[in-house]
């Protein structure tokens, strides 16, 4: 059957931990992505940012997992109002920020 939302969020958190843990070289060769507002709709916004990073196997699983939280299909070049369009950050920092926010959401019981 379908994975419970709490399990899916915990698995996403653990995947982000693995990414930050296994950084030997700069993540995704130091690629830059749009920063996002960590608010409602944040999963789609995060996916929209990360989907524009190509050729980076380290975040492919994260992209797939985020797509499970986003109710609509996301493709490269797509941007929502949740992006801070004047601010780009490295993928590594993006992942760290997202991880901390997701841990707080998990604590608050916001699994969707």
């Amino acid at each position: 059957g379908p994975v419970p939302p709490s399990t899916a969020l915990r698995e996403l958190i653990e995947e982000l931990v693995n990414i930050t843990q296994n950084q030997k070289a700069p993540l995704c060769n130091g690629s830059m992505v749009w920063s996002i507002n960590l608010t409602a709709g944040m999963y789609c916004a995060a996916l929209e940012s990360l989907i524009n990073v190509s050729g980076c196997s380290a975040i492919e699983k994260t992209q797939r997992m985020l797509s499970g939280f986003c109710p609509h299909k996301v493709s490269a070049g797509q941007f929502s109002s949740l992006h801070v369009r004047d601010t780009k950050i490295e993928v590594a920092q993006f992942v760290k920020d997202l991880l901390l926010h997701l841990k707080k959401l998990f604590r608050e019981g916001q699994f969707n």
Epitope: R10, E14, V17, T20, L100, K103, K104, R107, Q110
Partner: antibody, heavy 122, light 108 residues
Framework: QMQLVESGGGVVQPGRSLTLSCAAS????????MHWVRQAPGKGLEWVGV????????HYADSVKGRFTITRDNSKNTLNLQMNSLRAEDTAVYYC???????????????WGQGTMVTVSS | SYILTQPPSVSVAPGQTATITCGGN??????VHWYQQKPGQAPVLVIY???DRPSRIPERFSGSNIGNTATLTISDVEEGDEADYYC???????????FGGGTKLTVL
Amino acid sequence: QMQLVESGGGVVQPGRSLTLSCAASGFEFRTYGMHWVRQAPGKGLEWVGVIWDDGSNTHYADSVKGRFTITRDNSKNTLNLQMNSLRAEDTAVYYCARAPQWYLTAEAFDLWGQGTMVTVSS
Amino acid sequence: SYILTQPPSVSVAPGQTATITCGGNLIGAKLVHWYQQKPGQAPVLVIYDDSDRPSRIPERFSGSNIGNTATLTISDVEEGDEADYYCQVWDYSSDTMVFGGGTKLTVL
């Protein structure tokens, strides 16, 4: 100012019971999860248990499960720790501490009492 | 249950940087809190949610949490920083709060 004050500590024989209290003041007690933490002489901190803001849930460390019971009275801003079947290894300073209540009780303890000493000895 | 491992002691000269670690399986997936405890006193929260600092705590105190290790860093160490430091997490699988064994920070 915000304050937690423990009371009820003392010397008790093994196998006997003791109840500790924690009086809260200066903040909205009913909106916080409340924890008990203990510290044996010369040892580290050991979490004892927690009661949720509305008293609906309690969780305990394995070392006290079935022997200790945490209750609260939000109308009186008090927290209690009922300790039964006390053992020598329960000898410690007992602290109450508050933590903002979320869906899960993973918050940090931002306010602690000064502690009360419990000695279990024959 | 979940285990947090801290070094028993860390020594540092005044003005230097102290690093206290807290190891745990995939601790990076948990929110880590740090407490300072001086002899005869109750613990005081110095870092919460991995890296946030209560308003009364100096900027010299910082935290990070990556992979299997959380770290408390105290820069420009002062004699008044000498104390025991404890890390703490909530273990979701057992519904228990867990403390590390504590690290005694000695300022030489």
